[in-house]
Interface confidence: low
């Protein structure tokens, strides 16, 4: 997170830290006691699928305070439409091997109903993004969980206000832009997969997933997030289906 | 809200209760009627919570101890009669007034629903947690807010 602040301990209780072979991989969002939402691109280069760990209740990576809960990732489900190395359909659903225990420091973020997300949450201007990613483009990652308030843009406005870059990916209907184009604040590498959380009348909802951008906090560019509302039915159907064998599963979308 | 009290016994009311503090018994002497005394006393001792005219859209206000109740006209609902029940009450307009989820219905008014782990309150729009750790709430902030002293 570039230009953010420390999320006070316990105030981002749905934030997930994903580790592979003990090393920081990505962020994620707890949506109930056994399921985590993250970004598909986080898993492009994974070879040791059995060494994936999700940590809940984490705050400061340099110390263990007893509120952390670690769970093996039993399954990673990615939409069949996602192509590794690209940006569209950048979403993954992770099934934990065992449920986490909900505590003051471990709470799920609400996965909203699609219509509510599209016609109400999408028009809430500011939302929070969080993670332990880089504090500057090409800089060091954070030890404490960072958080940033970002404004959402309509895709048309995002395209009009962004500098044209020759090989820049399209902003599709499965994405949205949020943040600042003045180079001051953005999510960054290492925050990928983490939550874009929107507050409405006293409750927080998952509206986006940290996905991609032209560098981090680059002048003339916004951060791009996976538009979660497009995947609500896909996620719910998967969460209700019986577990399948194998760690990586490509599930048909839509 | 309590204009009728003024015409009851203006002289003694001014003398006993407005120029100086009066007790419930003294007020009872003035009004000679338990119900009217009670109505006067709620407003007199506690301040009239209806004084700020909180009930909107033609709703009438009844003062209570440290609170008030709005009686809404048929086309309105909500604590302050602020929500329209009529054709404007559809989900695309301010989420239909619902705290969480809203469903439109042909021929009848919209209905509000809540996420799992919450249930709908009697006002038909608000949601209350039914589990210890409902999604989307931050326990340490909820507890902090709950322990803050309330303004009078």
């Amino acid at each position: 997170i570039v230009g953010g602040k420390v999320c006070p301990k316990g105030e981002c209780p749905w934030q997930v830290l994903l580790l592979v072979n003990g090393a920081q991989l990505c962020g994620g969002t707890l949506i109930n006691t056994i399921w985590v939402v993250s970004a598909a691109h986080c898993f492009d280069k994974i070879k040791n699928w059995r060494n994936l760990i999700a940590v809940l209740g984490e705050h400061d990576l340099s110390e263990h305070d007893g509120d952390e809960q670690s769970r093996r990732v039993a399954q990673v489900i990615i939409p069949s439409t996602y192509v590794p190395g690209t940006t569209n359909h950048d979403i993954a659903l992770l099934r934990l091997h065992q449920p986490v225990v909900l505590t003051d420091h471990v709470v799920p973020l609400c996965l909203p109903e699609r219509t509510f997300s599209e016609r109400t949450l999408a028009f809430v201007r500011f939302s929070l993004v969080s993670g332990w990613g880089q504090l500057l483009d090409r800089g060091a990652t954070a030890l404490e969980l960072m958080v940033l308030n970002v404004p959402r843009l309509m895709t048309q406005d995002c395209l009009q206000q962004s500098r044209k870059v020759g090989d820049s990916p399209n902003i599709t209907e499965y994405m949205f832009c949020a943040g600042y184009s003045d180079g001051s604040k953005d999510s960054c590498k290492g925050d990928s997969g983490g939550p874009h959380a929107t507050h409405y009348r006293g409750t927080w909802y998952l509206t986006g997933i940290v996905s991609w951008g032209q560098g981090c906090a680059t002048v003339g560019h916004f951060g791009v997030y996976t538009r979660v509302s497009q995947y609500i039915e896909w996620l719910q159907k998967l969460m209700r289906s019986e577990p399948r064998p194998g760690v990586l599963l490509r599930a048909p979308f839509p | 809200a309590n204009a009728f009290l003024e015409e009851l016994r203006p002289g003694s009311l001014e003398r006993e209760c407005k120029e100086e503090q009066c007790s419930f018994e003294e007020a009872r002497e003035i009004f000679k009627d338990a119900e009217r005394t009670k109505l006067f006393w709620i407003s007199y001792s506690d301040g009239d919570q209806c004084a700020s005219s909180p009930c909107q859209n033609g709703g009438s206000c009844k003062d209570q101890l440290q609170s008030y109740i709005c009686f809404c006209l048929p086309a309105f609902e909500g604590r302050n009669c602020e929500t329209h029940k009529d054709d404007q009450l559809i989900c695309v307009n301010e989420n239909g007034g619902c705290e969480q989820y809203c469903s439109d219905h042909t021929g009848t008014k919209r209905s509000c629903r809540c996420h799992e782990g919450y249930s709908l309150l009697a006002d038909g729009v608000s949601c209350t947690p039914t589990v210890e750790y409902p999604c989307g709430k931050i326990p340490i902030l909820e507890k902090r807010n709950a322990s803050k002293p309330q303004g009078r």
């Epitope: 109930n32 039993a74 225990v101 969460m239 209700r240 019986e242 | 469903s103 799992e116």
Partner: antibody, heavy 122, light 107 residues
Amino acid sequence: QVQLQESGPGLVKPSQTLSLTCTVSGYSISSDSAWSWIRQPPGKGLEWIGYIYYSGSTNYNPSLKSRVTISVDTSKNQFSLKLSSVTAADTAVYYCARSVNYYGNSFAVGYWGQGTSVTVSS
Amino acid sequence: EIVLTQSPATLSLSPGERATLSCRASQGISDYLHWYQQKPGQAPRLLIKYTSQPATGIPARFSGSGSGTDFTLTISSLEPEDFAVYYCQNGHSFPLTFGAGTKLELK
């Protein structure tokens, strides 16, 4: 094939504690399921008592919460129910059960024990 | 808590006929409703989960529909083994609650 088997005394005296055990076979109790107790008084409907995860987290019916304890013994692949201060109103068939899948708070009970009848009487 | 009201309490039909059982929730529960069948002396058996998804091994004559507060279990053509008590269950909010049941009896 998942199988659940309830065991415990069929007769309990009023004011005593009812204790039942559910032995699970064909499935590791330390997996991701929720393990429930549900009861059915004679000739009446079903009442959910509560459940436990391997992780140890529990959720009880508020109407029984003050009297109920559900615990798990992973080494024996068993989970147990204790219901204190019983009265004749606690006379019922007690079922142990496993949820088919788990999604937030919403799960359907796909596997049931055959039930054990408990009578509360002096 | 969410109260589920099942109707009718008793339904008398003959084999081959169509059975329609109703379950009404005291407040909206989206599609978090499950149906069970129970025969005398047996444990309940899951028929339908999440309003309309048949559980493993359930015959195609059983189907479920509805959303919000009104739900229906339909048995398209009754077989002799279908005569039993049917319960609906709320899976939306704790405590998990069951309806009082509908007894489907032979006419």
